[in-house]
């Protein structure tokens, strides 16, 4: 069965401050008012949940207070920002979208965005 289509960029480079942003777009087959977005990180064969938010269409995404993610929504697009990234966090970040309400339930999983994180070089000591 063809799952709901979810599109996301193939590659994103995190900023020198460890911030990466990307758009997750889904082709909604229904008239959902409540949507759940989950970001999963796949490294080797391990998959871990990075963050998740449920939002009402037209409202802001609300992640938990201690989440490293923030986001905004516009129609069938979600703009996701992940902060606090370090080189060791380089990996494939998968966007999972679920249309929770009203029924019917739909689930879609993107192909993933490879986020590259390069730790900034430490500033050389200055001699004055």
């Amino acid at each position: 069965c063809k799952a709901m289509h979810v599109a996301q960029p193939a590659v994103v480079l995190a900023s020198s401050r460890g911030i990466a942003s990307f758009v997750c777009e889904y082709a909604s087959p229904g008239k959902a008012t409540e949507v759940r977005v989950t970001v999963l990180r796949q490294a080797d064969s391990q998959v871990t949940e990075v963050c998740a938010a449920t939002y009402m269409m037209g409202n802001e995404l609300t992640f938990l207070d201690d989440s490293i993610c923030t986001g905004t929504s516009s129609g069938n697009q979600v703009n996701l920002t992940i902060q606090g990234l370090r080189a060791m966090d380089t990996g494939l970040y998968i966007c999972k979208v679920e249309l929770m309400y009203p029924p019917p339930y739909y689930l879609g999983i993107g192909n993933g965005t490879q986020i590259y994180v390069i730790d900034p070089e430490p500033c050389p000591d200055s001699d004055f």
Epitope: C1, A3, M4, P29, G30, K31, T38, L40, Q42, S45, V47, I94, K96, E98, L99, P103, P104, Y105, Y106, L107, I109
Partner: antibody, heavy 116, light 106 residues
């Protein structure tokens, strides 16, 4: 309340075709996909495919793609599953079910027996 | 196709018991999993969708958990009406079902 009512049991000869109907009521027919699933005696459940009445689009399990045809008549909120070139191992209970990516209401099942 | 392996294939339990049924996928399915209950002569009934979400009208003693390739259906306190066969279902790619777990009275 939501109901999916299927046509009655069928007995067919090998090589024949069977067409099972599924009449929906209690909801907006075009809002949900109609899936078809079968269960052969002593076997597990097997997904055949779905049709989306809203657009007429469908998708099939590759195993059934050449033999199964799913159609709908939106005017009477009815879905159909036709299986051709029947074999004895097609003997099973055939279910329709409504849903998106979860099948929340099912028909009562239609027993199709293929026997010479 | 993704293969779903359910275990055990059958189990005997008493009313009030905690029952756990597991389902393993041949590859990561990212929580794209449903659970159904089936009683003899009846159509299957949706219990859990998206691995963890309780379907409408399903008692809260049923719960689903898991991620990646491994998933669990738990019945916290088995009731007389829960003796049935339970199936998991993968909803990625070609939908496939587990072989079923028959829960019988001990």
């Amino acid at each position: 309340q939501v109901q999916l009512v299927q046509s009655g049991a069928e007995v067919k000869k090998p090589g024949a075709s069977v067409k099972v109907s599924c009449k929906a009521s209690g909801y907006t027919f075009t809002d949900y996909k109609i899936h078809w699933v079968r269960q052969a005696p002593g076997q597990g459940l097997e997904w055949i495919g779905y049709i989306y009445p809203y657009s007429g689009s469908s998708d099939y399990n590759q195993k059934f793609k050449s033999r199964a045809t799913l159609t709908v008549d939106n005017s009477i909120s009815t879905a159909y599953m036709e299986l051709s070139r029947l074999r004895s191992d097609d003997t099973a209970v055939y279910y329709c079910a409504r849903g998106g990516d979860a099948m929340d209401y099912w028909g009562q099942g239609t027993l199709v027996t293929v026997s010479s | 196709d993704i293969q779903m392996t359910q275990s055990p294939s059958s189990l005997s339990a008493s009313v009030g018991d905690r029952v756990t049924i597991t389902c393993g996928a041949s590859e990561n399915i990212y929580g794209a999993l449903n659970w159904y209950q089936r009683k003899p002569g009846k159509a299957p009934k949706l219990l859990i969708y998206g691995a963890t979400n309780l379907a409408d009208g399903v008692p809260s003693r049923f719960s689903g958990s898991g991620s990646g390739r491994d998933y669990t259906l738990t019945i916290s306190s088995l009731q007389p009406e829960d003796f049935a066969t339970y199936f998991c279902q993968n909803i990625l790619g070609t939908w496939t079902f587990g072989g079923g777990t028959k829960v019988e009275i001990k």
